[in-house]
Amino acid sequence: AVNGTSQFTCFYNSRANISCVWSQDGALQDTSCQVHAWPDRRRWNQTCELLPVSQASWACNLILGAPDSQKLTTVDIVTLRVLCREGVRWRVMAIQDFKPFENLRLMAPISLQVVHVETHRCNISWEISQASHYFERHLEFEARTLSPGHTWEEAPLLTLKQKQEWICLETLTPDTQYEFQVRVKPLQGEFTTWSPWSQPLAFRTKPAALGKDT
């Protein structure tokens, strides 16, 4: 179990959750492993049990408090260890000094809704979830629209380089079904990555009026 290639990656959602993934080629599926969190300036220690998510990877969430509580700051350091049981003892398999605001991955945007729809355009809004007030306006978004006959992977990415929780989609086809997704990323952090994509929002453009184009 020790000799396979291993990887340990964790992200902070900016509020009260650190999510970790541990992968190791050749590890037994029933190996018992956990993540232990030891902060440098907090009174708590936290542990979560790594549960299998695929053949060679395990995941768990360190829940630090209420979802919207600000449990860590930019000066915190949390030492994270992967511990796996070997017989009667626990062995350290991976270790890192984790700087939460260098390793951000926010929750997917929520509450997507159509504000206004016409024949060729649609205005959509959304909200960010469990995002720290520390960011102020230092966030960016990516959005994509699924057109009929295409896949999400083919959809061009629209980049919003500021904290703008709405978009006006243009040059749409009348009377056509579309789907829309958005994701968010803070500008801060060397290892920060995009949030998951939001749940898709389905909408339909209005049919063109007979005899004229609106």
């Epitope: 020790v2 000799n3 290639t5 291993s6 990887q7 340990f8 990656t9 030891w38 440098d40 350091i77 030492t79 260890r81 062995r91 350290v92 398999m93 991976a94 270790i95 890192q96 000094d97 984790f98 700087k99 260098e102 390793n103 060397e190 290892f191």
Partner: nanobody
Framework: QVQLVESGGGSVQPGGSLRLSCAAS????????MSWVRQAPGKGLEWVAS????????DYADSVKGRFTISRDNAEDTLYLQMNSLKPEDTAVYYC???????????????????RGQGTQVTVSS
């Protein structure tokens, strides 16, 4: 670009001490785990010690445990190796090495290094 420059090597008698330094530049030093490795004449690279980004976790090869201490000064972007009770078998070129992330893996400490310096020679003999 990433640069690692070792210094502090030299000749010393058995039982003596040396302190190696490694000046790092070209990356955010505190965001990365670091290590020392060495290469004795005619031998392959041997892992010596590793340290997490803020020094809260350290690991040592059995051959140096209790004699060597790895540490770092993130304000100065410098990695250190304090070597005490030196033995002839510690003779080697010592390299400072950067891991590719903030994580290192104690069971396979040689894995995941992406840069190392030019090295500094340590000779232990009477």
């Amino acid at each position: 670009q990433v640069q690692l420059v070792e210094s502090g090597g030299g000749s010393v008698q058995p039982g003596g001490s040396l302190r190696l330094s490694c000046a790092a530049s070209g990356f955010t030093f505190s965001n990365y785990a670091m290590s020392w490795v060495r290469q004795a004449p005619g031998k392959g690279l041997e892992w010596v010690a590793s340290i997490t980004g803020f020094g809260r976790g350290t690991d040592y090869a059995d051959s140096v445990k209790g004699r060597f201490t790895i540490s770092r000064d993130n304000a100065e972007d410098t990695l250190y190796l304090q070597m005490n009770s030196l033995k002839p078998e510690d003779t080697a070129v010592y390299y400072c090495a950067k891991y590719s992330s903030s994580t290192y893996y104690p069971p396979t400490p040689a894995r995941g290094r992406d840069y190392r310096g030019q090295g500094t020679q340590v000779t232990v003999s009477s």
